[in-house]
């Protein structure tokens, strides 16, 4: 997908909202494990996946879906400030682990003050744009591979 | 010019649907995180629902399930369609890019019960 393929997508989310994310995969991966990770320093951690967990928390805020002909569903809830941050769709496929998909969360605050706001026109605190850090020589999605 | 243009808000009853759209020109459309909020004379403005430039989606659980995000970036268009409106929906509803951060003028919505 090349280099701006690479880039994650920019999702903004305000506090206590849900978002939706789908990752599409290479229908030979049909019957691999896909997982939900948050990207950290340390590597991805995987938050859920498509693994049947029986042990799974009852107050769990991530659901994943896989909905067939290739097409995978991400759902998180109740999203809070600290859930901010960099997240992946991955697939332990033929071709070893891939990042089908990453998203950059931002969290918007519960209320923004007012003055903030310059109705039809530029605001001045305009956000950071945060896939503005990515590198742009990092490699394809197709080069990935989970750390 | 960079500007975002709403449009579709209007008066409809207890039930009814409506499909707001946001024209946007002077900003790359395609790359922008989208979102459309609301604001009511007696609470903050909030936001509804958001779009991500790929089209992940984010939606407040007030209008979950009845609200649907979407766009149409070889039209430069965000869009809001909004089912099963209820009185508490009646608000002024902007649509805001979030890079450059820019908002539209806003659209009544009122539902009469």
């Known amino acids: 997908q090349g280099i701006v393929g690479s880039l994650p997508e920019v999702l903004q989310a305000p506090v206590g909202s849900s978002i939706l994310v789908q990752c599409h995969y290479r229908l030979q991966d049909v019957k691999a494990q896909k997982v939900w990770c948050r990207f950290l320093p340390e590597g991805c951690q995987p938050l859920v996946s498509s693994a049947v967990d029986r042990r799974a928390p009852a107050g769990r805020r991530t659901f994943l879906t896989d909905l067939g002909g290739g097409l995978l569903q991400v759902e998180m809830v109740t999203l809070q400030e600290e859930d901010a941050g960099e997240y992946g769709c991955m697939v332990d496929g033929a071709r070893g682990p891939q990042i089908l998909h990453r998203v950059s969360l931002n969290i918007l605050p519960p209320e923004e003050e007012e003055e903030t706001h310059k109705i039809g026109s530029l605001a001045e605190n305009a956000f950071s744009d945060p896939a503005g850090s990515a590198n742009p020589l990092e490699p394809s999605q197709d080069e990935k591979s989970i750390p | 010019q960079v500007q975002l243009v709403e449009s579709g808000g209007g008066l409809v009853q207890t039930g009814g649907s409506l499909r707001l759209s946001c024209a946007a020109s002077?900003?790359?459309?395609?790359?922008?995180?989208m979102g459309w909020y609301r604001q009511t004379p007696r609470k903050s403005r909030e936001a509804v629902a958001t779009?991500?430039?790929?089209?992940?989606?984010s939606y407040i659980d007030a209008v979950k399930g009845r609200f649907t995000i979407s766009r149409d970036n070889a039209k430069n268009t965000l869009y809001l369609q909004m089912n099963s409106l209820e009185p508490e929906d009646t608000a002024v509803y902007y649509c805001?890019?979030?890079?450059?951060?820019?908002w539209g003028q806003g659209t009544q919505v009122t539902v009469s019960s």
């Open positions: 779009i991500g430039n790929r089209g992940s989606v």
């Open positions: 002077g900003i790359s459309f395609s790359d922008a995180a």
């Open positions: 805001r890019s979030f890079q450059p951060d820019l």
